[in-house]
Interface confidence: low
């Protein structure tokens, strides 16, 4: 039910090329296509070059996407596009120009000298942003999530895009400098995530990260479940990132008992962060299910 | 033939450390993931932790955190254990296991 | 931590005799994704152990198939349908679903 046909504006097709391109990289991934019929893996990349032929469309000439050309640039989904066609590259053939083109915009256009990224025109589906609706820490939230899409894109673009070491230290910095006065585990997780990828989630910090977690086993704010599925995928990633595998078991185990299978509205950002997660964790951690299987932890064919 | 080589007894002074290896043959290395585990004299099996070849990544059983550290080298398809602060209640056979098990090395403590 | 409970401590048979081991777990071995990580070893006198069977009941290469195991969630049982000589030694049990792993205390099968 994740291989959808994208259709839309510049939005819309993002909402409905993210469930096939997480879909196609988890079963690449944890090499389960056996499962679903081999066949069915050309189908599912033929939908995502149509998404992604559609959404050059709505490429404006400073290289940004909005939901229409006309409208203002959004800062969140150019970032948004940035992440899901670096996952993207290695399933089909993504101009690099487009995607760092982005990055580029990303950096010169949207990041204050502090190291936060704005956003002057919002997307009209709020429901795609997932956690970041009515964020109260937008600065860390949005910040942490354009540098976690900066980081996917750092081997594509770095030669392309001079700044981009630059920018990414500077975000960090912000995130850093700031990340012991938040209150919301969502906020917590994203930005953990961001860091740990920088390898800036130690001492206090670590230990805040850690200490958010309810029951050593989610990140959960009062309100919506799919926001929390989120976070919790971001916490995952920053574990697996963090290389200390003692804490992942009971936050896969508590991913997993949501029986979250992506799909339907505002699912966007959990459905693309649950798969990223778990996809990443049968791939790194030494874990249960493939210990005492023995089973050989196959690198991705491709 | 699939093997783990272990290296060989040691005998050292108690609070010294000790680094013993555990060399895979016969198959793809980074395939399997490493256990380690301790047998005391004519003792039960105690799991200390594993490794992820692959990236490098541990799980160890809380009661021998700060005691085991586990480690890798792709390169020669080798993975180490060092035990620190060593005493007499060290003083066992370890084995490595993925899921073949090494012939164990045994470690004596003792002024 | 899962305690594992073997019983008999030992065993004493006669070749070309059955043998039955148990091993009682704290905790359901029952995993999230529907599978049981329980796993059988033996060592031999003065060697390293060797697995014999994983996921309850699967059988490693070139293991005899005089070898079963059997059980679910707490309850699991090793059986050996004719004891040779080479099966003498220590058999544990180990569960690979909870961390930290956790092994039985072994159970010594003697040749009588």
């Known amino acids: 039910h994740l291989i959808v046909t994208p259709s839309g504006c510049g939005e819309q097709n993002m909402i409905g090329m993210t469930p096939t391109v997480i879909a196609v990289h988890y079963l690449d991934e944890t090499e389960q296509w056996e499962k679903f019929g081999l066949e069915k893996r050309q189908g599912a990349l033929e939908l995502i070059k149509k998404g992604y032929t559609q959404q050059l469309a709505f490429r404006q000439p400073s290289s940004a996407f909005a939901a229409f050309v006309k409208r203002a640039p959004s800062t969140w989904l150019t970032a948004y596009v940035v992440k899901v066609f670096s996952l993207a590259v290695n399933l089909i053939a993504i101009d690099s120009q487009v995607l760092c083109g982005a990055v580029k915009w990303l950096i010169l256009e949207k990041q204050k000298p502090d190291g936060v990224f704005q956003e002057d025109a919002p997307v009209i589906h709020q429901e795609m942003i997932g956690g970041l609706r009515n964020n109260n820490e937008k600065d860390m939230a949005l910040t942490a999530f354009v540098l976690i899409s900066l980081q996917e894109a750092k081997d594509i673009c770095e030669e392309q895009v001079n700044s981009l070491p630059g920018s990414i230290t500077k975000a960090g910095d912000f995130l850093e400098a700031n990340y012991m006065n938040l209150q919301r585990s969502y906020t917590v997780a994203i930005a953990g995530y961001a860091l740990a990828q920088m390898g800036r989630l130690k001492g206090p910090l670590l230990n805040k990260f850690l200490t958010t977690a309810k029951d050593k086993n989610r990140w959960e704010d009062p309100g919506k479940q799919l926001y929390n599925v989120e976070a919790t995928s971001y916490a995952l990633l920053a574990l697996l990132q963090l290389k200390d595998f003692d804490f992942v078991p009971p936050v896969v185990r508590w991913l997993n008992e949501q029986r979250y299978y992506g799909g339907g509205y505002g699912s966007t950002q959990a459905t693309f962060m649950v798969f990223q997660a778990l996809a990443q964790y049968q791939k790194d951690a030494p874990d249960h299910q493939e210990l005492n299987l023995d089973v050989s932890l196959q690198l991705p064919s491709r | 033939e699939v093997q783990l080589q272990q290296s060989g007894p040691v005998l050292v002074k108690p609070g010294a450390s000790v680094k013993m290896s555990c060399k895979a043959s016969g198959y793809t290395f980074t395939n399997y993931y490493i256990n380690w585990v301790k047998q005391s004299h004519g003792k039960s099996l105690e799991w200390i932790g594993v490794i992820n070849p692959y990236n490098g990544g541990t799980s160890y059983n809380q009661k021998f955190k700060g005691k085991a550290t586990l480690t890798v080298d792709k390169s020669s398809s080798t993975a180490y254990m060092e035990l620190n602060s060593l005493t007499s209640e060290d003083s066992a056979v370890y084995f490595c296991s993925s899921p073949y098990w090494g012939q164990g090395t045994s470690v004596t403590v003792s002024s | 931590d899962v305690l594992m409970t073997q019983t008999p401590l030992t065993l004493s048979v006669t070749i070309g005799q059955p043998a039955s081991i148990s091993c009682k777990s704290s905790?359901?071995?029952?995993?999230?994704?529907?599978?049981?990580?329980l796993n059988w070893l033996l060592q031999r006198p003065g060697q390293s152990p060797k697995r014999l069977i994983y996921?309850?009941?699967k059988l490693d290469s070139g293991v005899p198939d005089r070898f079963t195991g059997s059980g679910s969630g707490t309850d699991f049982t090793l059986k050996i349908s004719r004891v040779e000589a080479e099966d003498l030694g220590v058999y544990y049990c180990?569960?690979?679903?909870?961390?930290?792993?956790?092994f039985g205390g072994g159970t010594k099968l003697e040749i009588k």
């Open positions: 180990w569960q690979g679903t909870h961390f930290p792993r956790t």
């Open positions: 905790q359901s071995l029952l995993d999230s994704d529907g599978k049981t990580y």
């Open positions: 996921l309850v009941s």
